[in-house]
């Protein structure tokens, strides 16, 4: 349905608070370097304009598209050229090219200082002094660091952030109340950002067919009692929501997400028995709850798929008549029966089934040709099962830190050209799969592990795309979305890599090591480990373990010394010399 004024329509649908929050997020995700005050000024101007359009939809400029209105506003920023360089050239373009241009300049790794958490009393004072500004600052800081963060979900995080301060700033022990909540929000926020980044990459790099396939598989696992037509409707709506958010259309995205939540709650009976507790909640919480809802129980008596997808003489006829619908139904039927499989595995199985039909439906005896298609799935299923088993055993044996180190070594040997900070970040996150998934029952391990790894590897792909250095990474990232993880798993030591020259500066440490948090110390040590492997890619596990044990001992010794800096200056070169000898 068309509206005379799109901006008035969205303002009325969303309400002023959500409208302002979403516009702030949109602007912060586009202009990531702009100061907070500049963005607040722009948002206030847009909001005032929207109100004039609500009062009179025929007022001047109220008929313009949101892209035109927002783009015009962004292009009024005086320092655009000096702050953003060639991004300023976007402003010379017309819509829709201008918005596409802004999207292309979103930076997944902006050069912004890490967020430092002030003292609890300082934060509580700021919260009480000006709650609205405090919460806007949160939206701004998160959005500029995570330019693809799912905007309506960020509003939910902001609501939880507000609730945490409202509760804890009145508590007897403010810090004990607040800090765990902030840690939880930070960790959940990073995870949410990474998951959404994969959705956007899926849509932008592989198209909406890839995203729809992912959604069919995931929603069929969640809602195994729902009919295929119902799942298809949800997939269509969900694809629209995420296409809008990934495309920077945050007001439309939030509005459509609210409509989807409304539809799901009005049609619970034909979707899932698990939606009930979500549907009593307020909007932001409701949408979040629906997105995270647990899998419904499988219908009591599902038949084997063999009858319709192997034994039937009509397989090729049905496939030819509507390929995507037939494959979609196959994926739905398989996924609803297999909540124990990762979505990526289900998509590989559907791909294998499609490839078999493409080959066999052109053969002399199609039925004979595809009769064993399900048996061909076995190696595809066993590969992630074995991978999860082996890595969980390794995690249980080593613990998280050493498991991360094993992955650091493994991935540095595979792709040594990748920058050290990226290898450290990605390997540390890959290593978190252990604590996240290995404690789960067998039936939940694979979906947890492989779908989490897909999210982490997408981060590697996104960072690598910005600064490509490895053909292997490019190949794994671009050839097939569903085979990314198996592609990286299959990479071996890069024999063509010329080892990095030894640089003593890289292994020079100072007394500031001693004041670092445990996490920061780990990152320092892991950075050194990556540099060691880049210097000696063929070093054995035992050699590397020896050097790392010596490193830990050297740091511990100097941090206990009276004159720490003198100790580092004296013991450091000895450690470097001993390490070089050990790796020779």
């Amino acid at each position: 349905d068309t509206h005379k004024s799109e901006v008035a329509h969205r303002f009325k649908d969303l309400g002023e608070e959500h409208f302002k929050g979403l516009v702030l997020v949109a602007f912060s995700q586009y202009l990531q370097q702009c100061p907070f005050e500049e963005h607040v000024k722009l948002v206030n101007e847009v909001t005032e304009f929207a109100k004039t359009c609500v009062a009179d939809e025929s007022a001047e400029n109220c008929d313009k598209s949101l892209h035109t209105l927002f783009g015009d506003k962004l292009c009024t920023v005086a320092t655009l050229r000096e702050t953003y360089g060639e991004m300023a050239d976007c402003c010379a373009k017309q819509e829709p090219e201008r918005n596409e241009c802004f999207l292309q300049h979103k930076d997944d790794n902006p050069n912004l200082p890490p967020l430092v958490r002030p003292e609890v009393d300082v934060m509580c004072t700021a919260f009480h002094d000006n709650e609205a500004t405090f919460l806007k600052k949160y939206l701004y800081e998160v959005a500029r660091r995570h330019p693809y963060f799912y905007a309506p979900e960020l509003l939910f995080f902001a609501a939880r952030y507000k609730a945490a301060f409202a509760e804890c700033c009145q508590a007897a022990d403010k810090a004990a109340c607040l800090l765990p909540k902030l840690d939880e929000l930070r960790d959940e926020g990073k995870a949410s950002s990474a998951k959404q980044r994969l959705k956007c990459a899926s849509l932008q790099k592989f198209g909406d067919r890839a995203f729809k396939a992912w959604a069919v598989a995931r929603l069929s696992q969640k809602f195994p009692k729902a009919e295929f037509a119902e799942v298809s409707k949800l997939v269509t709506d969900l694809t629209k929501v995420h296409t809008e958010c990934c495309h920077g259309d945050l007001l439309e995205c939030a509005d459509d997400r609210a409509d989807l939540a409304k539809y799901m709650c009005e049609n619970q009976d034909s979707i899932s028995s698990k939606l009930k507790e979500c549907c009593d909640k307020p909007l932001l919480e409701k949408s979040h709850c629906l997105a995270e809802v647990e899998n419904d129980e499988m219908p009591a008596d599902l038949p084997s798929l063999a009858a319709d997808y192997v034994e039937s003489k009509d397989v090729c006829k049905n496939y030819a008549e509507a390929k995507d619908v037939f494959l979609g139904m196959f994926l739905y039927e398989y996924a609803r029966r297999h909540p124990d499989y990762s979505v990526m595995l289900l998509l590989r199985l559907a791909k294998a089934y499609e490839a078999t039909l493409e080959k066999c439906c052109a053969a002399a005896d199609p039925h004979e040709c595809y009769a064993k298609v399900f048996d061909e799935f076995q190696p595809l299923v066993e590969e992630p099962q074995n991978l999860v088993k082996q890595n969980c055993e390794l995690f249980e044996q080593l613990g998280e830190y050493k498991f991360q180190n094993a992955l650091l070594v493994r991935y540095t040997k595979k792709v040594p050209q990748v920058s050290t900070p990226t290898l450290v970040e990605v390997s540390r996150n890959l290593g978190k799969v252990g604590a996240k998934c290995c404690k789960l029952p067998e039936a939940k391990r694979m979906p947890c592990a492989e779908d989490y790894l897909s999210v982490v590897l997408n981060r590697l792909c996104v960072l690598h795309e910005k600064t490509p250095v490895s053909e292997k990474v490019t190949k794994c990232c671009t050839e097939s979305l569903v085979n990314r993880r198996p592609c990286f798993s299959a990479l071996e030591l890069d024999e063509a890599y010329v080892p990095k020259a030894f640089n003593a500066e890289t292994f020079t440490f100072h007394a500031d090591m001693c004041t670092l948090s445990e996490k920061e110390k780990q990152v320092k040590k892991q950075t050194a480990l990556v540099e060691l492997v880049k210097h000696k890619p063929k070093a054995t596990k035992e050699q590397l373990k020896g050097v790392m044990d010596n490193f830990a001992a050297f740091v511990e010794k100097c941090c206990k010394a009276d004159d720490k800096e003198a100790c580092f200056a004296e013991e450091g070169p000895k450690f470097v010399a001993a390490s070089q000898a050990a790796l020779a």
């Epitope: 008596d301 599902l302 192997v310 799935f377 039936a443």
Partner: nanobody, 123 residues
Framework: EVQLVESGGGLVQAGGSLRLSCAAS????????MGWFRQAPGKERERVVS????????YYADSVKGRFTISRDNAENTVYLQMNSLKPEDTAVYYC????????????????WGQGTLVTVSS
């Protein structure tokens, strides 16, 4: 601990009948699809027949259709395989298996396996 115990195997003349039983313990029987697989000497294990959790759906390999019948009794935690018109090529060790999640009835979808019972069909 999950246990599947097969019984009812033995030596039978071609054209004769046997009824195999598989008693399950240590699992929620009604939550598992059940299947019978067989392995003849020197050959790979093959699926013979499987039955859905509630018993409403069955899958039969072409080689046994019309001769074998699978059934289950969820109250007794037991699955049965009635084998009629037996042939020498039916000679094999018959394994009972349970699948928490199943789409295809293929071997890799089955989580628990019995030790097997030998069926010998003489000509």
């Amino acid at each position: 601990e999950v246990q599947l115990v097969e019984s009812g195997g033995g030596l039978v003349q071609a054209g004769g009948s046997l009824r195999l039983s598989c008693a399950a313990s240590g699992l929620t029987f009604s939550s598992y699809a059940m299947g019978w697989f067989r392995q003849a000497p020197g050959k790979e294990r093959e699926r013979v027949v499987s039955i859905s959790r509630g018993g409403g759906y069955t899958y039969y390999a072409d080689s046994v259709k019309g001769r074998f019948t699978i059934s289950r009794d969820n109250a007794e935690n037991t699955v049965y395989l009635q084998m009629n018109s037996l042939k020498p090529e039916d000679t094999a060790v018959y394994y009972c298996a349970a699948a928490r999640y199943w789409a295809t009835g293929s071997e890799y979808e089955f989580d628990y396996w019995g030790q097997g019972t030998l069926v010998t069909v003489s000509s």
